[in-house]
Interface confidence: medium
Amino acid sequence: SIPWNLERITPPRYRADEYQPPDGGSLVEVYLLDTSIQSDHREIEGRVMVTDFENVPEEDGTRFHRQASKCDSHGTHLAGVVSGRDAGVAKGASMRSLRVLNCQGKGTVSGTLIGLEFIRKSQLVQPVGPLVVLLPLAGGYSRVLNAACQRLARAGVVLVTAAGNFRDDACLYSPASAPEVITVGATNAQDQPVTLGTLGTNFGRCVDLFAPGEDIIGASSDCSTCFVSQSGTSQAAAHVAGIAAMMLSAEPELTLAELRQRLIHFSAKDVINEAWFPEDQRVLTPNLVAALPPSTHGAGWQLFCRTVWSAHSGPTRMATAVARCAPDEELLSCSSFSRSGKRRGERMEAQGGKLVCRAHNAFGGEGVYAIARCCLLPQANCSVHTAPPAEASMGTRVHCHQQGHVLTGCSSHWEVEDLGTHKPPVLRPRGQPNQCVGHREASIHASCCHAPGLECKVKEHGIPAPQEQVTVACEEGWTLTGCSALPGTSHVLGAYAVDNTCVVRSRDVSTTGSTSEGAVTAVAICCRSRHLAQASQELQ
Amino acid sequence: QEDEDGDYEELVLALRSEEDGLAEAPEHGTTATFHRCAKDPWRLPGTYVVVLKEETHLSQSERTARRLQAQAARRGYLTKILHVFHGLLPGFLVKMSGDLLELALKLPHVDYIEEDSSVFAQ
């Protein structure tokens, strides 16, 4: 049998008596910023090079007794999880360790910064293949640590970090809150979020995905053949660093954006029991458990998209929230969500030469979220077409008029506090797939894209009786790019994409009463790229 | 004792290298901001990361660090430059009294200053 954690991340076709998926990450170097390590442990001997970098604070307490095996414990275990020859994920990956945590597992932001700088300088002096940096540590939110991670990521380095073990919003911690970093929460053998004493894994919109992080067998620094079971988001992050090394070894040219999208795409979906998370965090927390891709090649043809939630706008009347895609991603649609239902919609707008998704709070609202649908679409040319409020009974319309441009998303934004009870369809009338339609007092925004072989279609699911939630999913081979609602008179809280499903939320039926409430229709825009599919077939 | 000697030596050097030009007013533009960890027990007051504007060169970082030392010395404060950053972010790590933050925030090229804080194995 193989340990539960390795089984969980391994697609069924790899499973055998021994966990030995093809190519163990041998083209990739993984940097570990942690405690000192026991480099002669059988699991990692010859695989981990201990650099001369050390920047740690003194241990607390005058009576602290330095014991080598305890000093090495955390780092040794993680090195084993990443590349251990028997209990590791990427058995072929080589590692370099930097000591930024002392014998009590404590370090400083400044020491970590200097460590990251050391990696960047090493990369410049001796460029090698793909680099993965594992940061199995967390501190309070730090602007400077996040900025350093951003710079390193933009230099082509993949950074993977622990979400934190504080049973709290990961956005309050660094480097977990850095958007460029792949932030990993922890789940157990039952796919439950990991509880650690009175605390547990962090959660929220800053977490990219979860991975095994409880009762993980790995190298123990007690002796060169000892093993120990450890738990935490560090262990979870180590799994993802190993998976990233495997993926990069198979496809060394992958960008950070491509790698992140693949990690999300190949994750197990909707297996985590969300009841563990605070209610207000459930919608924001990704229900994804990391896994290796079923085959190392052939994923290139797919149109990959992910959902990015903004921070909460706050309750002030003119408050807005902004969701952004990564530099290599295209914003294909923008939606908004408010728990109170009081919002003034959303719009796509240019900011620093890039489209962002901005949601607007309304008077008396508790705040809004902007939700961006961020996709990998090579050679894309996207623009936003806006129609101002029409003030005509027929409503506001906007369509993609340029030749070869297809509609990937619709947004609607209104200045008035209340659009009234009669909201005509937010999307196009039937038979006009390249058109968005909205209330006459709202401005409507169509996201129109041209990319080789890109085709899109609209899919609706309407429920006549009022429902708290209406969903519509794109079928196999199609990717959800846009998600919005065609409301009747029901009070829509907003719309957002969860994996390939468009979710439209309405106010709780029990509080609104269902007598006069109208139907709610969830509208998905589903796209695929024939060009990407063709290119992939030609390669094979 | 060693540390004190080191600090004294740096103070003397800072005073010696002070020039009229070092006292010039900071560049006009946006005011630099100060950040610190929201979790009080994790704060490490007395050590600060001074982050300079994106295009600042290493020589300017070193000059700004020396300027801070000189201006601090003029006010009777010891400072110690622990590290000069370049490669990822321009800036420097300085050990100094929090009393000097206002002064440091007015230095040319400064984007923001962050008080050092703890990180922990997870």
Partner: antibody, heavy 121, light 109 residues
Framework: EVQLLESGGGLVQPGGSLRLSCKAS????????MHWVRQAPGKGLEWIGR????????KYNEKFKGKATISRDNSKNTLYLQMNSLRAEDTAVYYC??????????????WGQGTLVTVSS | DIQMTQSPSSLSASVGDRVTITCRAS??????LTWYQQKPGKAPKLLIY???SLQSGVPSRFSGSGSGTDFTLTISSLQPEDFATYYC???????????FGGGTKVEIK
Amino acid sequence: EVQLLESGGGLVQPGGSLRLSCKASGYTFSSYWMHWVRQAPGKGLEWIGRIDPYSGGTKYNEKFKGKATISRDNSKNTLYLQMNSLRAEDTAVYYCARYGYYLGSYAMDYWGQGTLVTVSS
Amino acid sequence: DIQMTQSPSSLSASVGDRVTITCRASQDVSRYLTWYQQKPGKAPKLLIYAASSLQSGVPSRFSGSGSGTDFTLTISSLQPEDFATYYCQAYDYSLSGYVFGGGTKVEIK
């Protein structure tokens, strides 16, 4: 099927030396540490040392340092034990054993059939 | 250095008997203790690893327990093929070496 086949045993003069071989098959040789263990007639098992075929790193029982040398040839999937300055008390059956990994522990899971070395004039 | 002491050094038992063999380490070896069975003229065979985990293919009448310094191998109902010598083996942290117990010979009564 994992198999370990020792050879090279026999009669050796006191003060002489010998080289034992252990040919491995049925698994990836470089992925598992290999041990040499001996057993004198009517006595218990005694560990001599081990090698990591992946890196070539070795560890020895203090008693055998300077007397035994363990090496390997990964291209031939073969483990070797060189013994020098042999004395009558080195008469024993010599076993090679694979060190297998079992969910957080190791054990000598496959053993060769053993080869008898007799040191006598 | 760690010493491994097995007791008894030999015992006589009948088919169907419950047999218990103990192994004591002079220092804590955690759960890193392995049991082997050896029949005359044959190589040792792995029975139990990590103190209590049964190697696949080994009958369930064999069980192991213990942690730290005291360990036990139990054969719940002795079978004719179980007459053999049993060795415990531990890992010596300080020497990065491997130490065997003196062996316990289980003979037919």
